[in-house]
């Protein structure tokens, strides 16, 4: 696993990462805790601490060395060097900078074999970013008059997102105001503690509900928006069933 806090963290978990030697049970290196190795891509803000772990066993106890971009990783390769904690099978780099970006490979070997695992480190100069909306959502939908429909907007934002559902409307038969800007109606919006703002549900729809629905998301950094179209069919006409999308409406922080 990797940490990205401002302070180094001690390894306090009780998993047996360090396997004692037993001459009668010689074996090649093996991973002892693959869960800690599942996340291969780590995007970490600059100045934070990163820790990569490769918990392993073997008999005799394997040695561990680290490569950066396929080459031997030496202390002089980065300002401030790095720490290797062999008993925890970890590599620790403090106060990472953009030049630390790259692939880090732990090479674990003994006389009976060798195994390796590669992590990719991306150092981001500044983490909070504009909201990112999942592609394809909200999805176009169609229903008959009197039917119900749901639009889903999946938001990824590492700062508090404000979500709005907006529809283009007409005033006095016109879609645009004197200033040339479209008439818009906010149908739903999120407060700080509002739940389910990522879902817009329309019930008992009429032909007037047909049109473009916009999911507009903002955080203090920037904005993002995506839209979908609702087609409302006469009652006698069955809707064209689109591929059903089952996406969790919760935004990820």
């Amino acid at each position: 696993d990797a940490i990205s806090s401002g302070d180094d963290e001690d390894d306090t978990d009780s998993s047996e990462d360090f396997v004692s030697e037993n001459r009668s049970n010689q074996r090649a290196p093996y991973w002892t805790n693959t869960e800690k190795m599942e996340k291969r891509l780590h995007a970490v803000p600059a100045a934070n601490t990163v820790k990569f772990r490769c918990p392993a066993g073997g008999n005799p106890t394997p040695t561990m060395r680290w490569l950066k971009n396929g080459k031997e990783f030496k202390q002089e390769h980065r300002i401030g060097g790095y720490k290797v904690r062999n008993q925890h099978w970890s590599l620790i780099m403090e106060s990472v900078v953009p030049s630390d970006k790259g692939n880090y490979t732990c090479l674990v070997e003994n006389e009976y074999g060798s195994i390796n695992h590669t992590y990719h480190l991306d150092v981001v100069e500044r983490s909070p970013h504009r909201p990112i909306l999942q592609a394809g959502l909200p999805a176009n939908a169609s229903t008959v008059v009197g039917g119900d429909v749901e639009f889903v907007c999946k938001v990824y934002s590492d700062a508090q997102p404000h979500i709005q559902w907006i529809k283009h409307v007409e005033k006095n038969g016109s879609k645009y105001g004197p200033d040339g800007l479209p008439y818009l109606k906010v149908l739903k919006h999120s407060g700080i503690n509002s739940s389910n703002a990522e879902v817009l549900a329309l019930f008992n729809v009429t032909e007037m509900d047909a049109g473009e629905y916009i999911c507009k998301v903002s955080n203090y950094i920037g904005q993002a928006n995506q839209s979908a179209w609702l087609t409302v069919l006469p009652k006698q006409q069955a809707p064209v069933r689109e591929k059903e999308i089952t996406a969790s409406p919760d935004y990820l922080e």
Epitope: P128, R130, N193, Y220
Partner: antibody
């Protein structure tokens, strides 16, 4: 290098208006909210509002609504903050800031009769 | 508006000391930012999203907390750390700042 460069100090009379500019460079101006924050002498920081240059969306602090106007000119990557009906307690340093980590150098506005 | 109350309002400490500044919010928040400001200068971002160090900020600064209680810690004060510190919430309009904590040399 990211820079937010603000216009120079202003001295105004009560009841007048002031318009402060903030020119952005080194990043995509339209992609990020431009916030305006002020600081009265010896006081803390106060958020006034923000404009999203891409589409002109604006959020105001209700305390200033009706007196503050935020605009932008995307062709020159510049945001503006105009404060009207000035009072003596509007004497402050006015900052533009984007993303929280980019700040202008501040513009001192003095309101005095 | 969400009110942020910092404590203490002022603090005297020595080089090498460990210092903690707290920020209490009138409503629960997802995140907190912390700024350092020196006289005549614009604020400088130290911590964003509660615990993330801004680029170029020394690792002696750290942030923590959740809900209504947040903390900025300086593990070992350096001469250049004497300044005023502000917490800020970017979660709910209008965005608000704490009243500030002035850190002075003892």
């Amino acid at each position: 290098e990211v820079q937010l460069v603000q216009s120079g100090a202003e001295v105004k009379k009560p009841g007048a208006s002031v318009k402060v500019s903030c020119k952005a460079s080194g990043y995509t101006f339209t992609n990020y909210w431009m916030h305006w924050v002020r600081q009265a002498p010896g006081q803390g920081l106060e958020w006034m509002g923000a404009i999203y240059p891409e589409n002109g969306d604006i959020n105001y602090n209700q305390k200033f609504k009706g007196r503050v106007t935020l605009t932008r000119d995307t062709s020159i990557s510049t945001a503006y903050m105009e404060l009207s009906r000035l009072r003596s307690d509007d004497t402050a340093v006015y900052y533009c800031t984007s993303r929280g980590d980019y700040w202008g150098q501040g513009t001192t506005v003095t309101v005095s009769s | 508006a969400i009110q942020l109350t910092q404590s203490p309002s002022s603090l005297s400490a020595s080089v090498g000391d460990r210092v903690t500044i707290t920020c209490s919010a009138s409503s629960g928040l997802s995140y907190m930012s912390w700024y350092q400001q020196k006289p005549g200068k614009a604020p400088k971002l130290l911590i964003y999203d509660t615990s993330n160090l801004a680029s170029g900020v020394p690792s002696r600064f750290s942030g923590s907390g959740s809900g209504t209680d947040f903390t900025l810690t300086i593990s070992s004060l350096q001469p250049e750390d004497f300044a005023t510190y502000y917490c800020q919430q970017w979660s709910s309009y209008p965005y608000t700042f704490g009243q500030g904590t002035k850190l002075e040399i003892k």
